[in-house]
Interface confidence: low
């Protein structure tokens, strides 16, 4: 293609020289350069007469010679107006003008469809000087034309601030039909009508379309481009293409597969990503989508315990991202999990079931009957409690966490202690005197820390007081106990 101003330049080989005079392109006369003798060269095969009025721009020079003879108007000479040729052939055309010698530095530029053409290797300008005038012949050559070279070409010359423009030369590149719209692959519902479109252009026109289904022609008579094929419905996959014919020959479009939508295949590789006491994170690999996008998926969860009632929990989720966190499960329980996904046609079968387990839970009940004593003789606080009732799924009790907060005159200090699972008492050192100690206890399993007991407060006096009685968890409805010894 010719390189236009403001477009990316494409390199071309230098034109190999004048075409042989006998070469013709699709019966259109080929223009050749004139001989170098004479200042008014004649253009070979020129289809216009020298005396015909010129439609291009004319410049009337204001300058006169020494003898004061007025100079003739300047204009490009007429040349061939229309060239028709096949793709990939070479073409050369020119425009010529005679310019008085008083004008220096005249240049001719080539324009196509209103844009200046850059790339000097396409254009050659030759000068044939004489006593009074110089004949200038500008030749433009294209070694292998393409469809994009179609268009209207003109020469321009600037003299004395005037622009001289030649008549246009129309280049028409003909070739095999060129597809501007080809049929597209589609996924269709079984026995449902759909349309396919095919459009191709020349030149030369007209372009006729034949449709092909699975290697057999669908229409006996061609249709003028563009053509829309209405297929009443399919029961199985088919391949369609279209043939575009013009006087130059035949072009065949790409073959496109028309798939029949079906229910998806079941998901595969359901796997456990993470397990906690009350949730299981699963992922899966979706099966084949049945030529229709997945809409959503369903996670089915059954208790694997043989004594369970066999009920199934169903969790619906979006098809992406193939990941779901199943929540509200029991701790330390076994579950069977399957996944099914749907598209617009329907639901897939359920994936192979996998077995998953939740981990131990944290205790759900706080220790009971928390009692706090001040043992002043050893400067300790003794704590006693009762083991909370634990559910089997809460897991095995591994110990207790004791929080004791010491508050005195704007100071607040919280400490944590740990005791083994067999204990039901603990001893903590007095941290601050003349202060309130608030004690709370939580049971601990491998599943986590349970709720803390209600706070029990005891006042730790200054040194020298007597140990009277314990503080303990209040009975329901009682006020917050603070025992001041």
């Amino acid at each position: 293609a010719i390189t236009e101003a403001r477009e990316e330049a494409k390199p071309y080989p230098l034109f190999p020289g004048p075409f042989p005079g006998s070469l013709q392109t699709d019966h259109t006369p080929l223009l050749s350069l004139p001989h170098a003798s004479g200042y008014q060269p004649a253009l070979m095969f020129s289809p216009t007469q020298p005396g015909r009025p010129h439609t291009g721009n004319v410049a009337i020079p204001q300058v006169t010679s020494v003898e004061s003879k007025p100079l003739p108007p300047l204009a490009f000479k007429h040349t061939v107006g229309h060239i028709i040729l096949s793709e990939h052939k070479g073409v050369k055309f020119n425009c010529s003008i005679s310019v008085p010698n008083i004008y220096q530095d005249t240049t001719i530029s080539w324009w196509k469809d209103g844009k200046e053409l850059l790339g000097a290797h396409h254009a050659i300008t030759q000068f044939y000087p004489d006593d009074e005038v110089t004949a200038i012949i500008a030749s433009f050559s294209i070694t292998s034309v393409q469809r994009s070279d179609n268009g209207s070409y003109i020469c321009k010359m600037k003299i004395n601030n005037e622009e001289i423009v030649s008549d246009p030369i129309y280049i028409e590149v003909q070739g095999l039909p060129h597809f501007t719209k080809q049929p597209e692959s589609m996924n269709v519902t079984r026995n449902t009508a759909f349309n396919l479109t095919c459009q191709a252009v020349g030149p030369p026109e007209p372009v006729n379309i034949f449709w092909v289904q699975n290697s057999s022609r669908v229409n006996e008579q061609p249709e003028k481009s563009p053509s829309v094929l209405t297929v009443p419905g399919l029961t199985e996959m088919a391949v369609f293409s279209c043939e575009a014919h013009n006087d130059k020959g035949l072009t065949v479009s790409k073959g496109v597969q028309i798939n029949i939508k079906a229910i998806p295949s079941p998901p595969t590789e359901v796997s456990i990503r993470n397990s906690t006491a009350h949730s299981i994170l699963i992922s899966w690999v979706p099966g084949f989508d049945g030529y229709s996008p997945f809409r959503n998926c369903s996670i089915q969860v059954k208790e694997a315990d043989p004594l369970s009632n066999g009920s199934v929990m169903i969790f619906n989720t979006s098809a992406l991202p193939h990941l779901y966190q199943i929540k509200q499960l029991q701790a330390l329980a076994n579950y069977s999990i399957g996944v099914s996904c749907m598209n617009e046609i329907g639901w897939s079968a359920v994936s192979p079931w996998i077995l998953a387990s939740t981990t131990e839970g944290a205790p759900s009940v706080a220790p009971l009957n928390v009692t706090v004593f001040l043992n002043e003789s050893s400067d300790n606080v003794d704590i006693r409690w009762m083991k909370p009732p634990t559910k089997q799924q809460d897991g095995e009790l591994v110990g207790y966490r004791i929080s004791h907060v010491w508050q005195s005159a704007g100071i607040s200090k919280e400490l944590l202690e740990e005791v083994g699972q067999n204990g039901s008492r603990a001893r903590i050192s007095v941290q601050v005197h003349n202060a309130t100690c608030t004690v709370r206890i939580a049971a601990v399993t491998r599943g986590g820390v349970g709720p803390f007991s209600d706070p029990v407060k005891i006042f730790i006096p200054a040194h020298g007081w007597v140990d009277y009685a314990p503080s303990s968890t209040p009975a329901p409805g009682n006020a917050d106990p603070v025992l001041i010894i």
Partner: antibody, heavy 119, light 107 residues
Amino acid sequence: QVQLVQSGAEVKKPGASVKVSCKASGYTFVSYWMHWVRQAPGQGLEWIGVIDPSDNYINYNQKFRGRVTMTRDTSTSTVYMELSSLRSEDTAVYYCAREAGTRGYFDYWGQGTLVTVSS
Amino acid sequence: DIQMTQSPSSLSASVGDRVTITCQASQSVSNTVAWYQQKPGKAPKLLIYYASNRYTGVPSRFSGSGSGTDFTFTISSLQPEDIATYYCRQDTRSPFTFGQGTKLELK
């Protein structure tokens, strides 16, 4: 005072087994869990497993399951860690560490036992 | 497994500098994070437990904070004897994983 004393360094061939001991003193042996941690040369710390001496509760890191065995002898206040099918990447210093309370931090550590696996 | 991502992996600081190390858990570990100090050829030593509690005898320049997934260990004023490798560790779920360690060097 609390002390955890481990057995001496060992050199083993690939495929062999090694048994490292950790003798506890200065506290009530059955009241504290004992963990095992290893450290390959120039690398970080890696948890192997835990044993509760009071009831022989054991929890192993899945990575070592099938190759590691933890036992305890309450009469000598000693815990043992045996690792079988040794490979060169098992070359490391193996530590026992006492867990304070029943959850969380390791307050006392053994001095470490270097196990070298080399053909 | 719960991953404990510790950063930076190494850092240089001067005596008296404030040094901060972070540890990010791949899922919530509540406050069950401990920080340990290890010097070459020695067993690790406990510094901080339950994310923010200083262990007995540990100098007050060492502190910890955070809960859930993000934890921070700070030395408020670096001393020469603090040059060591520091590790975080979670105890929420077995296997009880450590961070990859932060090697602290003197500038």
